[in-house]
């Protein structure tokens, strides 16, 4: 805390200006207003205070905004914002994207802090749901923000926010949460023809249901082994040796390489292997010929 | 994490001249503001010019001698100093504002010693 001391004679502040930066902390404190300070926000980020100076600041402004900043000077907090605690953003009712992302710019290229994450959280509940806008500036900002988010989080993204969603804001997207999205895409995407439709749906098929893949196998999708490798084990493992031959088209010759891992060799396991045969892809592991497979599942469903 | 290493410090004559130099390393993408600050025994650090983007800014007692100067591509601040004067003699530090979190970084200081 800055000791209360009078301001020198002839220094205290008409405007926020670059003069500023040459005072000490208790000048900064003894004089400059706390109104004078909250009328010209907008003129802060533009001068190179430094950080501990930006203390003094953000001390005038809590002084004066007990309850919390309005929005207002938050849109011009810019680098003053790195000061601010989550508890400091609890208080705040950011409603503008334009504040968001002026905010955001400050932290551009480092990872998500706590502040920006109470700030997103602030603003999403905000508005109640996670519109197509702010998805569209959240990921910009943050490519792996929408698999940061859990299940019930992601059930609030309404399918046309589906549109802002890039291939690589879901590479860090576990099962559980594409199992979300996944469903929000089809819907989204639903309008759209064969070739064009699987492009878009591509990256959220770790998503997807058996029927599902079964249909696309129907359509000359060519799947590429790097998607098949992200199903879902339990929606491969129904799928026939023809279904996944059409399903991966000239990319079936991938499946040799990928032999040993999952869900490839979850699937193998469960062909016969006449049908593994016929692929010439030298395939092992599947049922033998003349062996019976009882599917003990269905069985317990009808006992 | 940013260092910094001041060179160029030194004994001058009054009306002499030195150039300040501060290199730096590490994760210098991340720097916004660079700043030159001095201490004269006894006294508090003071700031004496700070460079940000292409702007640049002085202390009055040294506007119009001193000049602050950054090149990107050698990741190096520069000072300046020309017609020295006695009251300039102090340790001369190098300070550079991470962009992305609240904190700073200083150089170990360099001496300079004005003498009449």
């Known amino acids: 805390e800055v000791e209360k001391t009078a301001c020198p004679s002839g220094k205290k502040a008409r405007e926020i200006d670059e003069s500023l930066i040459f005072y000490k902390k208790w000048e900064l404190e003894a004089c400059v207003d706390a109104a004078l300070l909250a009328t010209q926000m907008d003129r802060v980020n533009a001068i190179p205070f430094t950080y501990e100076q930006l203390d003094v600041l953000k001390h005038k402004l809590d002084e004066l905004y007990p309850q919390g900043y309005p929005e207002s000077v938050i849109q011009h907090l810019g680098y003053l914002f790195l000061k601010m605690s989550p508890e400091d953003i609890r208080k705040w009712n950011v409603t503008s994207l334009e504040t968001l992302k002026a905010l955001l710019e400050v932290n551009k290229g480092h990872e998500m802090s706590p502040q920006v994450a109470t700030l997103i959280d602030r603003f999403v509940k905000g508005r109640g749901q996670l519109d197509k806008d702010t998805l569209d500036t959240l990921t910009a900002f943050y490519p792996g923000y929408l698999c940061s988010l859990s299940p019930e989080e992601l059930s609030s993204v309404p399918p046309s926010s589906i549109w802002a969603v890039r291939p690589q804001d879901l590479d860090t997207c576990d099962p559980r949460q594409l199992d979300v999205l996944y469903p929000k895409a089809r819907l989204a995407f639903q309008n759209m023809n064969g070739s064009e439709y699987f492009v878009k749906i591509q990256s959220f098929l770790g998503g997807a249901p058996t029927e599902d893949l079964k249909a696309l196998s129907q359509q000359n999708v060519s799947m590429d082994l790097a998607t098949f490798m992200k199903l879902r084990t339990d929606a491969v493992l129904p799928l026939t040796v023809a279904e996944v031959q059409k399903l991966l088209g000239p990319h079936v010759e991938g499946l040799k390489a990928e032999e040993r891992h999952r869900p490839v060799r979850d699937w193998i396991l469960r062909q016969r292997q006449d049908d593994l045969d016929t692929l010439g892809l030298g395939l092992q592991g599947g049922i033998p010929n003349g062996y019976l497979v009882l599917d003990l599942s269905m069985q317990e469903a009808l006992s | 994490q940013v260092q910094l290493v001041e060179s160029g410090g030194g004994l001058v004559q009054a009306g002499g001249s030195l150039r300040l130099s501060c290199a730096a390393s590490g994760s210098t993408f991340r720097i916004r503001v660079m700043r030159w600050y001095r201490q004269a025994p006894g006294t508090e650090r003071d700031l004496v010019a700070v460079?940000?983007?292409?702007?640049?800014y002085y202390a009055d007692s040294v506007k119009g001698r001193f000049t602050i100067s950054r090149d990107n591509a050698k990741n190096t601040l520069y000072l300046q100093m020309n017609n020295l004067k006695p009251e300039d003699t102090a340790v001369y530090y190098c300070?550079?504002?991470?962009?992305?979190?609240?904190?700073?970084?200083w150089g170990q200081g360099t001496q300079v010693t004005v003498s009449s």
């Open positions: 300070n550079a504002d991470d962009s992305g979190i609240a904190r700073d970084y």
């Open positions: 460079i940000s983007g292409s702007s640049t």
